[in-house]
Interface confidence: low
């Protein structure tokens, strides 16, 4: 009798396990707000999807607590170094939690890509990739920030993106 | 009686779940064809393996539909910037599907690595990493392309590679 | 009787599957030993954790054999190119196994980041990310090495890190 009862529970758990939370969000024309806020993302069109995670104002929102591999790539590019542009670009994944008023740095990279351009008219490209495992509680959110976001180059959702899956 | 019958099915599913599809393919001397096609990969020797995925002419072939984290790294290097070499190198993962005649861009990076070399005799190295979750149907294929592939530096399979696993 | 017996085994396996091995280790002030050994890591504080893996002198130690996605990122930075510094930085993940006396290269990147600095007083930043799937036996270890480690920039555990999870 026990096994049969447990059986239903296991079947149920196995079915829910089928939808291991995962998401891949893609860059879009609206990604760069210029407002100092995080990047915004496409959640449905093309390669973008949400499965067992939700989205709100640039943030992946966790519905099931656990360890997640989170990742983001941003495509950077420019012509020379724009006036007033810091020589350092910071690309990071940050956590927002209801229990704490400030965002928490999770994974961060600093790069000096436009130092590659030896003349002011030289076109340059660079890419920054971040990925790592973090523990996230239900209701916590992860966002991507790039400073200076003026150097993020969007095109078709394949060059700048943001995703996660439970491990 | 039902539970016992379902039991066999679950055991079967669990066993198949043991072999969660995964692969890691490594760069080899034969990887760079110079033909304009995708990179070719080692599938068996050394660190390379296929588990629940197959391989054909440079492509990882999906046998079980689902969401996959796919990744690739390529090691780039050179001495100065070869004559006629575009200042931009594009490294990408592309999908081939029976339902569509052209390859579809999945994850792409552009870099200007040899802009780092301030003189024509300066040796430079750079690396490009891509990774992200995409949905793949059975029979669909993923390939890696690098333009200009003349800058890909192969050695022992640890510096340029291509892989995937179901999430 | 068989199904009931197998049932206990499956429940047991399912429970152990709950704790799918995973770890994320973070950079700390003690990471850089200057001894020529691998980087050392924080295993408990902040974002760092071990789940189903153990740690010893810079190494992630495997307790359950299987395929693992292993990854590392290091933050590099400097002012110009220090005297005597090789223009190439090598960042790699290496395996130690009881069956073999030498470390085995798993995933490696070479970069020439300080070539970006066009003057000796120019500050530059770069980041190197590695990730890939490898098979690891129980008792085998994975370490991170950076040559020249003088260019690794530590801060708060978000910029340089090392992790793994079973796939």
């Amino acid at each position: 009798d026990g096994p049969a009862g447990s059986w239903e529970q296991l079947i149920q758990e196995r079915r829910s396990h089928e939808v291991n939370p995962a998401a891949h969000l893609t860059g879009a024309n609206s990604s760069l707000t210029g407002s100092g806020g995080p990047l915004l993302w496409e959640t449905q069109l093309g390669l973008a999807f949400l499965r067992g995670l939700s989205y709100h104002d640039g943030a992946l929102v966790v519905t099931k607590a656990g360890y997640y591999y989170i990742y983001s790539k941003v495509q950077l590019g420019g012509v020379g170094c724009p006036l007033g542009l810091a020589s350092t670009i910071t690309h990071g994944l940050y956590k927002r939690t209801p229990r704490y008023p400030e965002e928490l740095e999770l994974l961060v990279s600093q790069q000096s890509p436009c130092g590659r351009a030896t003349s002011s008219s030289r076109v340059w490209w660079d890419s920054s990739f971040l990925g790592g495992v973090v523990h996230l509680e239900a209701g916590e959110e992860v966002v991507v920030r790039v400073l200076d976001e003026r150097l993020v180059r969007l095109r078709d959702g394949t060059r700048s993106y943001f995703g996660a899956f439970m491990v | 009686d039902g539970p016992a019958g379902s039991w066999e099915q679950l055991i079967q599913e669990r066993r198949s779940h043991e072999v969660n599809p995964a692969a890691h393919l490594t760069g080899a001397n034969s990887s760079l064809t110079g033909s304009g096609g995708p990179l070719l990969w080692e599938t068996q020797l050394g660190l390379a393996f296929l588990r629940g995925l197959s391989y054909h002419d440079g492509a990882l072939v999906v046998t079980k539909a689902g969401y996959y984290y796919i990744y690739s790294k390529v090691q780039l290097g050179g001495v100065g910037c070869p004559l006629g070499l575009a200042s931009t190198i594009t490294h990408g993962l592309y999908k081939r599907t029976p339902r569509y005649p052209e390859e579809l861009e999945l994850l792409v990076s552009q870099q200007s690595p040899c802009g780092r070399a301030t003189s024509s005799s300066r040796v430079w190295w750079d690396s490009s990493f891509l990774g992200g979750v995409v949905h793949l149907e059975a029979g669909e294929e993923v390939v890696v392309r690098v333009l200009d592939e003349r800058l890909v530096r192969l050695r022992d399979g640890t510096r340029s590679y291509f892989g995937a696993f179901m999430v | 009787d068989g199904p009931a017996g197998s049932w206990e085994q499956l429940i047991q396996e399912r429970r152990s599957h709950e704790v799918n091995p995973a770890a994320h280790l973070t950079g700390a002030n003690s990471s850089l030993t200057g001894s020529g050994g691998p980087l050392l890591w924080e295993t408990q504080l902040g974002l760092a954790f071990l789940r189903g893996l153990s740690y010893h002198d810079g190494a992630l130690v495997v307790t359950k054999a299987g395929y693992y996605y292993i990854y590392s990122k290091v933050q590099l930075g400097g002012v110009g190119c220090p005297l005597g510094l090789a223009s190439t930085i090598t960042h790699g993940l290496y395996k130690r196994t009881p069956r073999y006396p030498e470390e085995l290269e798993l995933l490696v990147s070479q970069q020439s980041p300080c070539g970006r600095a066009t003057s000796s007083s120019r500050v530059w930043w770069d980041s190197s990310f590695l990730g890939g799937v490898v098979h690891l036996e129980a008792g085998e270890e994975v370490v991170v090495r950076v040559l020249d480690e003088r260019l690794v920039r530590l801060r708060d555990g978000t910029r340089s890190y090392f992790g793994a999870f079973m796939v």
Partner: antibody, heavy 124, light 112 residues
Framework: QVQLQQSGPELVKPGASVKISCKAS????????MNWVKQSHGKSLEWIGR????????FYNQKFNNKATLTVDKSSSTAHLELLSLTSEDSAVYYC?????????????????WGQGTSVTVSS | DVVMTQTPLSLPVSLGDQASISCRSS???????????LHWYLQKPGQSPKLLIY???NRFSGVPDRFSGSGSGTDFTLKISRVEAEDLGIYFC?????????FGGGTKLEIK
């Protein structure tokens, strides 16, 4: 309660620079944007830009790109506006103002608290 | 930049009267997240601006219910149902949907 206390009036010569401050209290300084707004005598308001104290992210109204520099000192919960190469056109009252950092549905999206203003007079 | 146009420039009223101020934007103010970031401020003589209404129609904390906001797209209105002496001053509309933030030219509410 939320308070933004600005530094006192400034009389400066043309071509000089001036740095005014805005000390925040009563809330988590790093958790909100700090905006700066210019009001010339008898005129409307002009948004100069804003800074996110947590990360140092800044965004400027292009009109003030080479005129204003925004900085923060997190240790003292103080934001600064530096005005460069001053001319008579820069004579105005400058306000700091807080806005929430997410633009979330539960937030106002507006500058919800303002400092009392700092008068800057440029005259030889 | 988004231009915010307020009318009238000056609005003479008697205490107890209803007052209505209009604000028109040169482009739509609906953000990609669905919110409309149109706000109203009151600046009394010698003081800094104070937030009255945010996101078109939401009263900020401590603001009396005689103040109400409405509108959509590019046309917005602030109404004061019964003007009191403490309501006199200059009213500004502002948008924070698009960067840079911009303000209207102001409407001076004064005693008739």
């Amino acid at each position: 309660q939320v308070q933004l206390q600005q530094s006192g009036p400034e009389l400066v010569k043309p071509g000089a620079s001036v740095k005014i401050s805005c000390k925040a209290s009563g809330y988590s300084f790093t958790g909100y944007f700090m905006n700066w707004v210019k009001q010339s005598h008898g005129k409307s308001l002009e948004w100069i830009g804003r800074i996110y104290p947590y990360s140092g992210d800044t965004f400027y109204n292009q009109k003030f790109n080479n005129k204003a520099t925004l900085t923060v000192d997190k240790s003292s919960s103080t934001a600064h506006l530096e005005l460069l190469s001053l001319t008579s056109e820069d004579s105005a009252v400058y306000y700091c103002g807080r806005s929430e950092h997410f633009g979330r549905n539960y937030g106002t999206g507006a500058v919800d608290y303002w400092g009392q203003g700092t008068s800057v007079t440029v005259s030889s | 930049d988004v231009v915010m146009t307020q009318t009238p420039l000056s609005l003479p009223v008697s205490l107890g009267d209803q007052a209505s101020i209009s604000c028109r934007s040169s482009q739509g103010l609906v953000h990609s997240n669905g919110n409309t970031y149109l706000h109203w401020y009151l600046q009394k003589p010698g003081q800094s601006p104070k937030l009255l209404i945010y996101k078109v129609s939401n009263r900020f904390s401590g603001v009396p219910d005689r103040f109400s906001g409405s509108g959509s797209g590019t046309d917005f209105t602030l109404k004061i149902s019964r003007v009191e002496a403490e309501d006199l001053g200059i009213y500004f509309c502002s948008q924070s949907t698009h960067v840079p933030y911009t303000f209207g030219g102001g409407t001076k509410l004064e005693i008739k």
